[in-house]
Amino acid sequence: TLNSVLNSNAIKNLPPPLGGAAGHPGSAVSAAPGILYPGGNKYQTIDNYQPYPCAEDEECGTDEYCASPTRGGDAGVQICLACRKRRKRCMRHAMCCPGNYCKNGICVSSDQNHFRGEIEETITESFGNDHSTLDGYSRRTTLSSKMYHTKGQEGSVCLRSSDCASGLCCARHFWSKICKPVLKEGQVCTKHRRKGSHGLEIFQRCYCGEGLSCRIQKDHHQASNSSRLHTCQRH
């Protein structure tokens, strides 16, 4: 069951506030509050910002990275921090906002000829066509002159949604993050009722596609809060 997976199978070496409910792709019930949503803290305001403890960059939103909140602070206490914009200092690619990568300690723009996650060596895989894509996270690795032009197809390992092809987002799937399809009209989605509430979502869903929003399905209005079904609906 979902609970047994959460409580006993996925063992997180993380601080206490983790282990919220997880949304199954295609499940009949929307996930409970307290779930990491693609994009993470970027929808929060300063007023209601709640630090989200983490152990690795993948546990943070697409515009965040995992680090100690204070310079030279306790290495054991790490939270998701807002990504660094262009020309800001960095130590690894994940610290830089989407569209940028870390070069010589500074976040610089990823132009067409550069992949933000230039990595130690070529890690490509064939998709049975003439194109290939990065297979592996682009974080905590050294620079090289290798270049990548193509985006990850469905199922490819990713770090951020910008690593994935159009119509896909980067979402957690057990111990990896992979490119998954952006949700279509009528598909079950994950609605987060409380801004700033996070939990580690084992099967992260993508967000709803363009022109759609995640809303309670009309015939589920009478249901209890915990069992309301959310689907992607036209604005």
């Epitope: 070496n13 993948e58 890690i123 592996g136 974080r139 199922g155 390992v157 057990f174 111990w175």
Partner: antibody, heavy 118, light 107 residues
Framework: EVQLLESGGGLVQPGGSLRLSCAAS????????MGWVRQAPGKGLEWVSA????????YYADSVKSRFTISRDNSKNTLYLQMNSLRAEDTAVYYC???????????WGQGTLVTVSS | DIQMTQSPSSLSASVGDRVTITCRAS??????LNWYQQKPGKAPKLLIY???SLQSGVPSRFSGSGSGTDFTLTISSLQPEDFATYYC?????????FGGGTKVEIK
């Protein structure tokens, strides 16, 4: 070229312990989740455990939970499987494997045989 | 747990034959289905991931199809080196589970 080399297998008595190692080379180790899969003699494949790239997230099959511990040392490019309270049914060839697209295991080691017998 | 049922469990075929192996999941697994080939005394080798994507270096005579619960591995023209055991695997839910295997033997 991706290479995964397991070691640490052998004969052990029921209730005993073993630690398997998997030395990885030819790819950026920290960027990949890794896993262990086993195969009992003459039988099919059974997933045992997996660990995220950073090592912060681990998963286990129910049959080994609380007895086996997966870990990794990214500074040494090495994956481990600590096996305690071994049982006869744990006898198998243990493979270490790299987790790729769709969480498929896209590269495998040659395997190391673990025999649990009195 | 999600059960993966492969059929047939074994088959005999000749070089040049078209071979089809099926795999059925006990519940929908979308396209989270992978196929492996294993020869005696050797480690498994990934052939197909995501139901239909050919792994790098795998000959194009291998193809995969399906979505949901029913999947197929096809070898369009069997070659001598293809005689082996084939396994399907789902990665939609933990525990990850494999099919029982299909042994392809020489007729």
């Amino acid at each position: 070229e991706v290479q995964l080399l397991e070691s640490g297998g052998g004969l052990v008595q029921p209730g005993g312990s073993l630690r398997l190692s998997c030395a990885a080379s030819g790819f950026a180790f920290t960027t990949y989740a890794m896993g262990w899969v086993r195969q009992a003699p003459g039988k099919g494949l059974e997933w045992v455990s997996a660990i995220s790239g950073s090592g912060s997230t681990t998963y286990y099959a129910d049959s080994v939970k609380s007895r086996f511990t997966i870990s990794r040392d990214n500074s040494k490019n090495t994956l481990y499987l600590q096996m305690n309270s071994l049982r006869a049914e744990d006898t198998a060839v243990y493979y270490c494997a790299r987790s790729g697209s769709f969480l498929s295991f896209d590269s495998w080691g040659q395997g190391t045989l673990v025999t649990v017998s009195s | 747990d999600i059960q993966m049922t492969q059929s047939p469990s074994s088959l005999s075929a000749s070089v040049g034959d078209r071979v089809t192996i099926t795999c059925r999941a006990s519940q929908s697994i979308s396209r989270h289905l992978n196929w492996y080939q294993q020869k005696p005394g050797k480690a498994p080798k990934l052939l197909i991931y995501g139901a239909s994507s050919l792994q790098s270096g795998v000959p194009s005579r291998f193809s995969g199809s399906g979505s949901g619960t029913d999947f197929t591995l096809t070898i369009s023209s069997l070659q001598p080196e293809d005689f082996a055991t084939y396994y399907c695997q789902q990665t939609y839910r933990t525990p990850l589970t494999f099919g029982g295997g299909t042994k392809v033997e020489i007729k």
